[in-house]
């Protein structure tokens, strides 16, 4: 089942989340002059078991002024996150699977790709909430919304964030994020999909987000 | 396969300045937040500044700022992060990484965590002499 609509939008607030539920789906787009390749994916899928999650499928563009003759190859991500770990071992490194299990990361970006991206997005997924640049957070309740399934519709909850402009300093509050729990999410409902840009992606967060250590900077 | 490649560490005096370079191809930064985490030997990463690719905005980490300035070039695909006054704790190697923007193209300073970049760079060492 589809979800009717996008996640609600907050006044001065913007939201992201870092992994997707099994059974998201990645367009594969292709920016201005570009297109995907004849044979190529029309898009990804987090799919996985138990224990590990990945994308299936790669997105591969190729110029639109050729005849397929110049593939661009793009490395599964699962392939991108193996090679970059051989080459810098450090805690920076990003696992090859979400930290959630049942769920993907950020896929990694693709030769020639669309500025932004389109998911198609099932029942359960979150999406977490901040205040954008000059803003402060007044919560009333989680700064989160989720895609559920009730009574075989599908709708979207209301975040429970209220952003205001009286900033006290320059310093970003100390906010935390959100402990994302598998528990308490409608994982047995039937899945539900929703297209959005990536503009508007959903995630899910699994670390305790720590104080905010940078100030800001309007250019 | 797509890469941030970094350059322009290197050792300098105490005082001194240095000019690091995080380049691309095959893919435009209009979408990402791009910037910089250093890790010195034995402790954790830290975010140092990054600039978005939707409206330039820049922000920085309180230990650097006012001393370094994140600047980038959309022709050459290219993020700087010019460092002056190096001090020994500037020290460490740095790793240039992506992240994509939020809802509306938005990006905040508290999503720039080292565990949810989506592409990293090799690094670069910095090495400051006292």
């Known amino acids: 089942e589809l979800c009717d609509d996008d996640p609600p939008e907050i006044p001065h607030a913007t939201f992201k989340a870092m992994a997707y539920k099994e059974g998201t789906m990645l367009n594969c787009e292709c920016k201005r002059g570009f297109r995907r390749i004849k044979s190529g994916s029309l898009y990804m899928l987090c799919t996985g078991n138990s224990s590990h999650s990945s994308w299936d499928n790669q997105c591969q563009c190729t110029s639109s002024a050729t005849r397929n003759t110049t593939k661009q190859v793009t490395p599964q991500p699962e392939e991108q996150k193996e090679r970059k770990t051989t080459e810098m071992q450090s805690p920076m490194q990003p696992v090859d699977q979400a930290s959630l299990p049942g769920h993907c990361r950020e896929p990694p970006p693709w030769e020639n790709e669309a500025t932004e991206r389109i998911y198609h997005f099932v029942v359960g997924q979150m999406v977490y909430y901040q205040c954008v640049q000059g803003y402060r957070a007044l919560h009333r309740g989680p700064a989160e919304s989720v895609c559920k399934m009730t009574h075989g519709k599908t709708r979207w909850t209301q975040p429970q964030l209220i952003c205001t402009g009286e900033m006290e300093t320059s310093q970003f509050p100390g906010e935390e994020k959100p402990q994302a729990s598998p528990e308490g999410r409608p994982e047995s409902e039937t899945s539900c999909l929703v297209t959005t840009t990536d503009f508007q992606i959903q995630t899910e967060m699994a670390a305790t987000m720590e104080t905010s250590i940078f100030t800001t900077e309007y250019q | 396969q797509l890469q941030l490649v970094e350059s322009g560490g290197g050792l300098v005096q105490t005082g001194g300045s240095l000019r690091l370079s995080c380049s691309t191809s095959?893919?435009?930064?209009?979408?990402?937040?791009i910037g910089w985490f250093r890790q010195a030997p034995g402790k954790e990463p830290e975010g140092v500044s990054y600039i978005t690719g939707s409206d330039g905005s820049t922000y920085y980490a309180d230990s650097v700022k006012g001393r370094f300035t994140i600047s980038s070039d959309n022709a050459k695909n290219t993020v700087y992060l010019h460092m002056n006054s190096l001090k020994p704790d500037d020290a460490a190697v740095y790793y240039c990484?992506?992240?994509?923007?939020?809802?509306?193209?938005?990006?905040?300073?508290?999503?720039?965590?080292?565990?949810?970049?989506?592409?990293w760079g090799k690094g670069t060492l910095v090495t400051v002499s006292s």
């Open positions: 990484a992506i992240d994509r923007l939020g809802s509306g193209g938005a990006y905040v300073p508290i999503w720039w965590r080292s565990s949810d970049m989506d592409l």
């Open positions: 095959g893919f435009t930064f209009d979408g990402y937040a």
